[in-house]
């Protein structure tokens, strides 16, 4: 069991467009057709102004107009909902498709892609209907931009909602060697296929990917719970032959100073095919990017039933060490190391300011906003420790 590991299925709260938890000041756009179709009118199910955000310029052939929502804190965004223009039922404008871009720091923007590399999302077929899009993979973002598309010169307008939850882990990025391919009766691709950072010279840095998406792999790493994906999809893996040092080194960057209790690493142990739990883990800590690593590394040797071939979460105690950066070495105990998820149990150190600049206002872990309720494909559950919005049978 992954303690502290978030469950993506429960991370589907309305983040505050419809219920105005997100203030007007956090909604902006590249342009607006008029003040009555300004960005602030882009709230799902709202009939304010002329009933939606409508850009001033055409979105065909250039797709440069966008609606931006600033969530103020990092959130995992699992779902988005879109509508066209209301205008007292007279609105005819909507967007048949759109793209998403997102940022964690307001400087570097990434385009959202699905698991097969598709960027374009099917949107609305009429102005009034709400269409939900499940984001697989979800995105960790503070800022989200919607770029409406059209296949001809036409007016498009948008109303939106975002669904998800606060990114409580605080993990901004991890750096790791590029995952490798294992050759069995078929090729098993153990790359991090949703990584949104940079890849240079066999190293991935500055991003997040499958090791932080909430999806844990199966006992048989060739299998995935995701449909129509390649063998090995849920795991990132490295071969002992490629690492003369005898370990894989990863670095983790967090949003602010944290006291780390433990790291949870979900590992495969199908040793009949070469996958083994790490023999040990060694982690170092530092408070800033240019600072020295502090004190002695924390070392943890793995015991337990290493012969059991089932995949499992390995807990690495971190002793409450305070840091914003961790560097961990995972020692090979067999031909391959295969990880599907890494999460951390930590507490923010009081008075530590966020790394992204500025101070964020407090945001609840479970945002209070209800979802849109006028269409049958959305399911409601009571408030409390349950999610309040889930997409049910929404089109892909």
């Amino acid at each position: 069991d992954m303690k502290g590991h978030f469950d993506p299925a429960k991370c589907r709260y309305a983040l505050g467009m419809q219920d105005r938890t997100i203030p007007d000041s956090d909604i902006s756009a590249s342009s607006s057709w008029s003040d009555s179709t300004a960005a602030r009118h882009s709230r799902l199910e709202s009939s304010d102004g002329d009933g939606a955000w409508c850009p001033a310029g055409s979105v065909f052939p250039k797709e440069e107009e966008y609606l931006q929502v600033d969530l103020q804190r990092l959130h995992l965004v699992a779902l988005v909902g879109t509508q066209g223009r209301h205008a007292g039922g007279l609105g005819k404008e909507f967007s048949r498709s759109y793209r998403l871009r997102y940022s964690r720091d307001g400087r570097r923007w990434m385009g959202w892609k699905d698991r097969w590399g598709q960027e374009v999302i099917s949107g609305n077929e009429d102005p009034e209907g709400v269409v939900l899009k499940d984001l697989g993979p979800p995105m960790v973002a503070r800022l989200v931009r919607f770029y409406p598309r059209a296949d001809r010169v036409m007016s498009v307008c948008l109303r939106v909602e975002l669904y998800g939850c606060l990114w409580r882990d605080g993990l901004l990025s991890y750096t790791a060697p590029v995952g490798q391919t294992m050759y069995l009766s078929e090729a098993v691709y153990l790359n991090d296929s949703t990584y949104d950072g940079h890849t240079v010279g066999g190293l991935q840095y500055g991003g997040l990917g499958q090791l932080a998406d909430g999806v844990v792999g199966l006992d048989d790493f060739r299998k995935s719970q995701e449909l129509r994906v390649w063998p090995g999809y849920d795991y990132v893996g490295w071969s002992n032959h490629s690492f003369s040092s005898g370990y894989v080194e990863m670095e983790f960057e967090f949003d602010r100073l944290r006291a780390f209790q433990a790291m949870q690493v979900h590992c495969n142990n199908m040793h009949t095919l070469g996958a083994r739990l790490p023999g040990g883990v060694e982690c170092r800590f530092r408070r800033g990017p240019a600072m020295a690593w502090e004190g002695e590394p924390m070392r943890h040797n793995l015991g337990g039933n290493l012969g059991d071939p089932r995949a499992r979460a390995v807990s690495v105690p971190l002793g409450g060490r305070v840091a914003r950066f961790l560097q961990c070495r995972f020692l090979f105990a067999g031909p391959w190391l295969l990880f599907s998820e890494i999460s951390f149990i930590s507490d923010v150190v009081n008075n530590s300011s966020p790394a992204l600049g500025g101070t964020f206002p407090p945001a609840p872990w479970w945002p209070p906003g209800p979802p849109p309720t006028n269409f049958s494909s959305l399911e409601l559950e009571p408030r409390g420790q349950q999610p309040v919005a889930k997409a049910e049978g929404s089109p892909t």
Epitope: D7, L218, R222, L227, V229, W230, P231, A391, G393
Partner: antibody
Framework: DVHLQESGPDLVKPSQSLSLTCTVT?????????WHWIRQFPGNKLEWMGY???????KYNSSLKSRISITRDTSKNQFFLQLKSVTTDDTGTYYC??????????WGQGTLVTVSA | DIVLTQSPTSLAVSLGQRATMSCRAS??????????MHWYQQKPGQPPKLLIY???NLESGIPARFSGSGSRADFTLSINPVEPDDVATYYC?????????FGSGTKLEIK
Amino acid sequence: DVHLQESGPDLVKPSQSLSLTCTVTDYSITSGYGWHWIRQFPGNKLEWMGYIHYGGSTKYNSSLKSRISITRDTSKNQFFLQLKSVTTDDTGTYYCATSGNYGFAYWGQGTLVTVSA
Amino acid sequence: DIVLTQSPTSLAVSLGQRATMSCRASESVDDYGTSFMHWYQQKPGQPPKLLIYRASNLESGIPARFSGSGSRADFTLSINPVEPDDVATYYCQQSNEDPFTFGSGTKLEIK
């Protein structure tokens, strides 16, 4: 292991809607996999009807698209099939099943539905 | 839609011998260097049971007497040696493209 069990009426009149429930035990339908409906006609031909993904999105066989709807109730860990305007050609055994990237690993026992006046 | 044609429609094999059946797809079912073709066994009154996934991988709990091979559009299921319990209908199924489709089946009997 995942266990699936179909339930619903065994007799439906032509032009009415067929509604079936699949109850899943020992696994949450929001945690992973696609949750499918497959039917087998009296001559043993198998037809995939559609699925609801663990995330909530759906895909349907285009031959049924205007008549089929698959939904779910996550609180009860159930998913549902609704097939509108049935004819005698819709008679068969209806299975719910689950799949990842490796075929339909788990199946219900199936329920025989007869469409007859 | 991808059409899967299975041959032969029925097959009679002596106990202890090898049974081989074929599945041909109307187009390739390969992607990412792997074949999204699966094989099932169905006995009367029971649901189909997964035997082989992605062309050649033996599903857990299935005896090693069953094996699968092939790529792109041509696939084979072999049973060696055949045992009495193998009497059933065998179906191939592709999951590379919507809609997922099944073959019409090969019925295995003991000679």
